[in-house]
Interface confidence: medium
């Protein structure tokens, strides 16, 4: 996505000689060399840049289409309901919006990877911020859903029962506000730079190395570790309670929830492991060498692609795991196809609303 030009040491002539003679591949350096100026592995970026040029535009284009269709469908299903949205449904709607906004930026990054950034500094800031806002929002909203389920089931408390719209909206606003705060560095430090090394203009961060490392740590902690810990904690307790109460119906309803969390972990863990390796290299805990640097760059492209795939995955999960979503999607399609058949929009949702446990501890993604 946003091109992160990592800081390199300055080549001394021994390295240039090695570069000219093609001896660069196995070069490594450690802490003991940090005093001598500019000893650096000569690391041409050709391979990782060519890989990005070939791999990212195709992937981003596919994810753009799938994400737009899938999340559009989720939003349509949720908004088509006559009854007020439950707290979980409201979070899901916001999640669909976040995922949609994120995939909307992918065509821009596809062009950036394929050719160069041709959209100017203003759009670079907006697209970068929009991307990160929704990256964080996706993770935090999933954490909110899990916390909501946790309160509902484990503590039999409905935080959002009295006046759900107000509290849920406030929570969602807090999430978006926090994400805007996390995206401030994008508004400030992102801009379109002509990079002489690459002879191309790219949407890049323009701040010291310490800021780059700090931002990556923030992304790792706030955008992944914290939400994942919240989800893991909440769902572990939920499952324990449901297993003890032998609530088979609830366990079935929990299936989608668990699948969504597992999907989040599977999609984003590889990327954040690569980011962790990069952070360790930035901090000097891991030696930087040509091979490792090139592998990290390629791994970052592949694993970030896998992460962005998560945006398109939620709608598919709802479709294949969530029975209610399939029903409602079908109803919606019928309604769109046959506008006169108003009777079809009367869905058997009242039974769910009337069931005593759903009021205090609904375990499912209620609208889906």
């Amino acid at each position: 996505m946003v091109l992160e030009v990592s800081d390199h040491q300055v080549l001394n002539d021994a390295e240039v000689a090695a570069l000219l003679e093609n001896f660069s591949s196995s070069y490594d350096y450690g802490e003991n060399e940090s005093d001598s100026c500019c000893t650096s592995p000569p690391c041409p970026q050709d391979f990782s840049l060519n890989f990005d040029r070939a791999f990212l535009p195709a992937l981003y284009s596919l994810l753009f289409l799938l994400g737009l269709l899938g999340n559009g469908a989720v939003a349509a299903v949720l908004l088509s309901r006559r009854t007020a949205l439950s707290s979980t449904d409201t979070f899901l709607l916001h999640l669909a919006v976040a995922d949609t906004l994120l995939v909307l930026t992918l065509p821009l990054w596809a062009v950036d990877a394929a050719v160069q950034w041709v959209f100017g500094s203003g759009l670079c800031k907006v697209a970068g911020a929009l991307f990160n806002i929704n990256f964080y929002a996706g993770a935090l909203l999933l954490a909110c859903i899990s916390f909501d389920r946790y309160l509902n089931i484990v503590h039999a408390t409905q935080l959002y029962r009295r006046g759900p719209p107000a509290r849920v909206t406030l929570t969602c606003l807090a999430v978006w506000g926090l994400c805007l705060l996390f995206a401030l560095p994008d508004f400030i430090f992102l801009s379109a730079h002509h990079d002489e090394r690459l002879n191309a203009t790219h949407c890049q961060y323009n701040f010291p190395q310490v800021g780059r490392t700090a931002l990556r740590v923030l992304q790792l902690v706030a955008g992944f570790l914290l939400p994942l810990l919240v989800m893991a904690y909440c769902y572990a307790h939920i499952l324990a309670v449901l297993l003890v109460s032998r609530g088979q119906r609830r366990l079935r309803a929990m299936r989608l929830v668990v699948v969504v969390v597992v999907a989040f972990a599977l999609c984003w863990t590889p990327y954040h492991l690569v980011v962790l390796v990069d952070i360790l290299m930035d901090l000097g805990a891991l030696a930087r060498n040509c091979g490792r640097e090139s592998r990290v760059d390629v791994a970052k492209s592949v694993t970030s692609g896998l992460g962005y795939m998560h945006c398109c995955l939620n709608p598919l999960l709802y479709a294949f795991v969530g029975v209610k979503f399939r029903e409602r999607m079908w109803m919606l399609l019928l309604r769109l196809g046959c506008p006169n058949q108003r009777g079809l929009q009367r869905q058997p949702s009242s039974s769910r609303r009337d069931s005593s446990w759903s009021e205090t501890s609904e375990a499912s993604y209620s609208g889906l």
């Epitope: 390199h8 040491q9 300055v10 002539d13 000689a17 650096s40 690459l198």
Partner: antibody, heavy 123, light 106 residues
Framework: EVQLLESGGGLVQPGGSLRLSCAAS????????MSWVRQAPGKGLEWVAT????????YYPDSVKGRFTISRDNAKNTLYLQMNSLRAEDTAVYYC????????????????WGQGTLVTVSS | DIQLTQSPSFLSASVGDRVTITCRAS?????LYWYQQKPGKAPKLWIY???TLAPGVPSRFSGSGSGNEYTLTISSLQPEDFATYYC?????????FGQGTKLEIK
């Protein structure tokens, strides 16, 4: 057009401190490693300090290590040299210089120089 | 530290002369760099990677050498060539310069 403009030079007493600045323009400052090179009156050139493009890596010869600190503000396109515990032998014209890029990496020689700023250490 | 010794330190020559400046390194270096400096001005990169002329440098200049001995040659001196020339090594830290060769009009 590449331009490097040094400032902050002047007369300082031995043991004193001075901070030199170098304002860069005409190129993408964030893409280049930068250095300070000095020249004592009527003498030859001496490399003083180098900093990588992101500011992570800094290098000094033994003659100034521990006394001088090179830094940069990429948002302001400015290079700095903080000089502490100044000695008479630090009297020189201080030049800010840019490192060229070779095969996607920074090369150690200097392709552009500023006009220099004179630092005089005397009591 | 690698010491660079330029010879001669002063050189008087006439326009049209062929001139050679030598730079000897106390230890072998990979490449040598040459800078031209005129009085009251900043140095300018003149030759890099031993023999590559910097942009704008006339073709009458050439650089050669390897290991411990390098030379800068001007095939036919022109009035604008009168200046001080410095050699520099960037093979090992600290990155040293020669003491300079002042080229004067005879």
């Amino acid at each position: 057009e590449v331009q490097l403009l040094e400032s902050g030079g002047g007369l300082v007493q031995p043991g004193g401190s001075l901070r030199l600045s170098c304002a860069a323009s005409g190129f993408t400052f964030t893409s280049y490693a930068m250095s300070w090179v000095r020249q004592a009156p009527g003498k030859g050139l001496e490399w003083v300090a180098t900093i990588s493009h992101g500011g992570t890596y800094t290098y000094y010869p033994d003659s100034v290590k521990g006394r001088f600190t090179i830094s940069r503000d990429n948002a302001k396109n400015t290079l700095y040299l903080q000089m502490n515990s100044l000695r008479a032998e630090d009297t020189a014209v201080y030049y800010c210089a840019r490192h060229p890029i070779y095969s996607g990496n920074y090369q150690g020689y200097f392709d552009y120089w500023g006009q220099g700023t004179l630092v005089t250490v005397s009591s | 530290d690698i010491q660079l010794t330029q010879s001669p330190s002063f050189l008087s020559a006439s326009v049209g002369d062929r001139v050679t400046i030598t730079c000897r390194a106390s230890s072998g270096v990979n490449y040598l760099y040459w800078y031209q400096q005129k009085p009251g001005k900043a140095p300018k990169l003149w030759i890099y990677f031993t023999s590559t002329l910097a942009p704008g440098v006339p073709s009458r200049f050439s650089g050669s050498g390897s290991g411990n001995e390098y030379t800068l040659t001007i095939s036919s001196l022109q009035p604008e060539d009168f200046a001080t020339y410095y050699c520099q090594q960037f093979t090992s830290s600290p990155y040293t310069f020669g003491q300079g060769t002042k080229l004067e009009i005879k």
